[in-house]
């Protein structure tokens, strides 16, 4: 996250991050139910851990934390890597989450978001494009939803419907490994992050987000029947 | 199947400007899922990045080269093109032009296509 | 600027050994952001690891990529003819750059 602010400790209990060895984050990822987690199809690896309720972005131990496997990934069946379109992916944990002040699911957005809507965009990823800088903790940013014409008009045949841009004004923007985290408009979960261009926080180069208004019945149905 | 060609003068004189052409066929410039890079590799000797250039057209180049390098793109002919100035003897190189993936998660994919690369002599 | 290098600068082997080539960094690199190259005469790199241990596409299983922070090794378990090259590696975590290279050679 660029030009964000630390979050407040366990404002953001769905926030989950995914890693590979024992402590490397590589991507965000979203607790959506007790067992099952939402991310970004980009953020498919074949061997990862995911980490919840954790503000740190160091590996040291933290009292709410809960570590989990993903023991099924189940990427849309309309990501075609590396593509934007249906970039999302549901992860189910090896168990269910303890419910906590600190780890808690949230629910998603049924309506897609309207132009202005502000929405609050998290993760451990970069704080500066150009140069890999991590934050300490994690990083909460306001963003704003912008207009279908805005944001096709900054990536010219890049944007279909399962997609939303969001930003505000340069120098504001989600960055490498932010992936397929959260964000939450009016208390409800409406996108991931997905892609945007580089270096990040761009004028008229907003951050681009899956938009899931378009996958509810999808992340059910597939949920229901695994 | 994506393709990269390399183009431009073989002899380039010392303090002129050297400018390569690299053509993509089989895809697309303009993706917001690919950046487009210059590597060189001088006689005998090892790789060296020169820089990339995003779908924006944003660049990002060696801090060692930064002050010569310049890499544009023109879209509608599907290509990008690398203009290295006050060149000198040191710069004699096989280029290569390369394509790269990115995104937002924490991950690097290297670089996945390459063209066959193109010999520049700096001499008088 | 991060500095990789790589040892031996040349390794002699017979087809069917093992070949470990190691690359070391100046500094702390995160594995995510480091890939393996393999090169032949005249022709172009091409690239066999990214991530630091994820195959690229149609690479054999026979390479495999391991290592974090700031030493990092790439295996051949079986060498088959075609794989006496040089191979490079490269880190992307500040502005990219190549270790100098180590050539397998047959012995």
């Known amino acids: 996250i660029v030009n964000g602010s630390d979050c407040q400790k366990d404002a953001q209990p769905w926030q989950g991050a995914l890693l590979l060895g024992p402590n490397k984050l590589y991507c965000g990822a979203v607790l959506i139910s007790p067992q099952w987690l939402l991310t970004a199809a980009h953020c498919r690896k074949p061997v990862f851990r995911i980490r919840l309720g954790h503000h740190s972005m160091s590996p040291v131990y933290e009292s709410g934390q809960q570590m989990f496997q993903g023991i099924k990934s189940i990427p849309h069946p309309g990501y075609s890597h590396p593509g934007h379109s249906n970039d999302l992916m549901l992860i189910k944990m090896n168990r269910k989450i303890r419910d906590s002040h600190s780890v808690k699911p949230v629910e998603i957005a049924c309506d897609c978001a309207t132009e202005g809507t502000r929405c609050m965009v998290s993760g451990w990823g970069t704080t500066s494009s150009s140069h890999n800088n991590f934050p300490k903790v994690l990083q909460c940013l306001n963003i704003t939803v912008l207009s279908e014409e805005r944001c096709k008009n900054s990536y010219p045949g890049q944007i279909d419907k399962t997609m939303f841009c969001a930003g505000d004004e340069e120098g504001r923007d989600s960055c490498q490994g932010d992936s397929g985290g959260p964000v939450v408009c009016n208390g409800k979960l409406q996108g991931l992050v997905s892609w945007g261009d580089f270096p990040c926080a761009q004028r008229n180069r907003p951050g681009v987000y899956t938009n899931l208004c378009e996958f509810v019945k999808w992340i059910k149905d597939t949920m229901n029947s695994n | 199947q994506l393709q990269l060609q390399e183009s431009g003068p073989g002899l380039v004189k010392p303090s002129e400007t050297l400018s390569l052409t690299c053509t993509v066929s089989?895809?697309?410039?303009?993706?917001?899922?690919?950046?487009w890079s210059w590597i060189r590799q001088p006689p005998g000797k090892g790789l060296e990045w020169i820089g990339n250039?995003?779908?924006?057209?944003?660049?990002y180049y060696n801090p060692s080269l930064k002050s010569r390098v310049t890499i544009s793109v023109d879209t509608s002919k599907n290509q990008f093109s690398l203009k290295l100035s006050s060149v000198t003897a040191a710069d004699t190189a096989v280029y290569y032009c390369?394509?790269?993936?990115?995104?937002?998660?924490?991950?690097?994919?290297?670089?996945?296509?390459w063209g066959q690369g193109t010999t520049v002599t700096v001499s008088s | 600027e991060i500095v990789l290098t790589q040892s031996p600068g040349t390794l002699s082997l017979s087809p069917g050994e093992r070949a470990t080539l190691s690359c070391r960094a100046s500094?702390?690199?995160?594995?995510?952001?480091l890939a393996w190259y393999q090169q032949k005469p005249g022709q172009a790199p091409r690239l066999l690891i990214y991530?630091?241990?994820s195959r690229a596409t149609g690479i054999p299983d026979r390479f495999s990529g391991s290592g974090s922070g700031t030493d990092f090794t790439l295996t051949i378990s079986r060498l088959e003819p075609e794989d006496f090259a040089v191979y490079y590696c490269?880190?992307?975590?500040?502005?990219?750059?190549f270790g100098g290279g180590t050539k397998v050679e047959i012995k």
């Open positions: 390369a394509r790269g993936e990115y995104d937002r998660s924490y991950y690097y994919w290297g670089l996945d296509v």
């Open positions: 089989g895809g697309s410039i303009p993706s917001s899922s690919y950046y």
């Open positions: 250039i995003y779908y924006s057209g944003s660049t």
């Open positions: 500094q702390s690199v995160s594995s995510s952001y």
């Open positions: 991530g630091a241990s």
């Open positions: 490269q880190q992307a975590f500040s502005s990219p750059t």
